[in-house]
């Protein structure tokens, strides 16, 4: 069965910068990726970025840059403005819509004891949904 993995890392050079990496492990082609924070989009989370393989990307602050890393993985750079967006304690979710599998979503966060530059392991947390 397909899986989605999520990594969250703090940049070693800029402690206020975070990057979310997400990937889809499975067959089929990706038609859309949605990244949210604070929980899954549609379940109390806030949409941060939408990436389409042909039409490009759309992001909302505090997202800084959303981009494709491979055909099945993306990265999203975020700028932490301090107390208003405490990313260190935030859950980030990535939802991959693929054909013909449907939608798969997984969430992750920065590990509590993360040193700058370290990231969460690329394993899906229990929130894994197939729509």
């Amino acid at each position: 069965t397909p899986e989605v993995w999520v990594q969250v890392q703090m940049e070693a050079t800029e402690l206020s910068s975070f990057t979310v990496h997400c990937g889809f492990l499975g067959p089929g082609s990706i038609s859309l990726v949605t990244v949210s924070w604070g929980g899954p989009d549609g379940a109390g989370g806030t949409k941060l970025a939408v990436l389409h393989p042909e039409l490009g990307t759309r992001q909302w602050a505090p997202a800084r840059q959303a981009r494709w890393e491979t055909q099945s993985s993306i990265s999203l750079a975020l700028e932490d403005s301090g107390a208003s967006s405490p990313f260190a304690n935030t859950t980030f979710c990535c939802k991959f819509a693929s054909f013909p599998e449907g939608s798969w979503e997984s969430c992750g966060s920065l590990p509590p004891s993360s040193d700058p530059g370290l990231s969460a392991p690329p394993t899906p947390v229990p929130i894994l949904r197939a729509d």
Partner: antibody
Framework: QIQLQQSGPELVKPGPSVKISCKAS????????INWVKQRPGQGLEWIGW????????KYNEKLKGRATLTVDTSSSTAYMQLSSLTSEDSAVYFC??????????WGQGTSVTVSS | DIVMTQSQKFMSTTVGDRVSITCKAS??????VAWYQQKPGQSPKLLIY???NRYTGVPDRFTGSGSGTDFTLTITNMQSEDLADYFC????????FGAGTKLELK
């Protein structure tokens, strides 16, 4: 079809506040940001702020110095903008607009606010 | 804040003309630019998104181009119904609009 229906024109005195509404229909209200935009007669457009109805997350144009407050009522698919400490500079047409992958793709018809003593 | 500069406030044109409206961003915004048309008493109407993608239902005489800091909206074979205000929007960092360009008949 997708529609954003805004409340009617407002004539208000300087000082207090005004609250205008934007009722969305034809799509899932909680899935799209709502932007608010100001247009003064013969002038350009100015972004006021946005709200994400799915979570209530807001961002504001810092030039407004905290005078704007954006809220939503998801049960009625309605977004609200309240503007306080009104002056004549706030006399304008205010638009709500749905913010999607395609930037602002659907707009309300606009609400005229006149601030006059 | 990112500033979007539309240097031409007014442009005179005639039916059948090719018209190019430009917009310059104060810093790199990639392709996060949209173009809108607005007629008096109406709401803005989306024409172009992601700098060069024509929105659904927009006639193919409207074309967007550019990336980084310089953007252009081109109308080929100008029609009388195209007389309106046109403005650009950047959505790379929050949202800022150009001041607008008004197309009028010569």
């Amino acid at each position: 079809q997708i529609q954003l229906q805004q409340s009617g024109p407002e004539l208000v005195k300087p000082g207090p506040s005004v609250k205008i509404s934007c009722k969305a229909s034809g799509y899932t209200f909680t899935d799209y940001y709502i932007n608010w935009v100001k247009q003064r007669p013969g002038q350009g457009l100015e972004w006021i702020g946005w709200i994400y109805p799915g979570s209530g997350y807001t961002k504001y144009n810092e030039k407004l110095k905290g005078r704007a407050t954006l809220t939503v009522d998801t049960s009625s698919s309605t977004a609200y903008m309240q503007l306080s400490s009104l002056t004549s500079e706030d006399s304008a047409v205010y638009f709500c607009a749905r913010d999607s992958f395609y930037a602002m793709d659907y707009w309300g018809q606009g609400t005229s606010v006149t601030v006059s003593s | 804040d990112i500033v979007m500069t539309q240097s031409q406030k007014f442009m005179s044109t005639t039916v059948g003309d090719r018209v190019s409206i430009t917009c310059k961003a104060s810093q790199n915004v990639g392709t996060a630019v949209a173009w809108y048309q607005q007629k008096p008493g109406q709401s803005p109407k989306l024409l172009i998104y992601s700098a060069s993608n024509r929105y659904t239902g927009v006639p193919d005489r409207f074309t967007g181009s550019g990336s980084g800091t310089d953007f252009t909206l081109t109308i080929t074979n100008m029609q009388s119904e195209d007389l309106a205000d046109y403005f650009c929007l950047q959505y790379s960092s929050y949202l800022t609009f150009g001041a607008g360009t008004k197309l009028e008949l010569k």
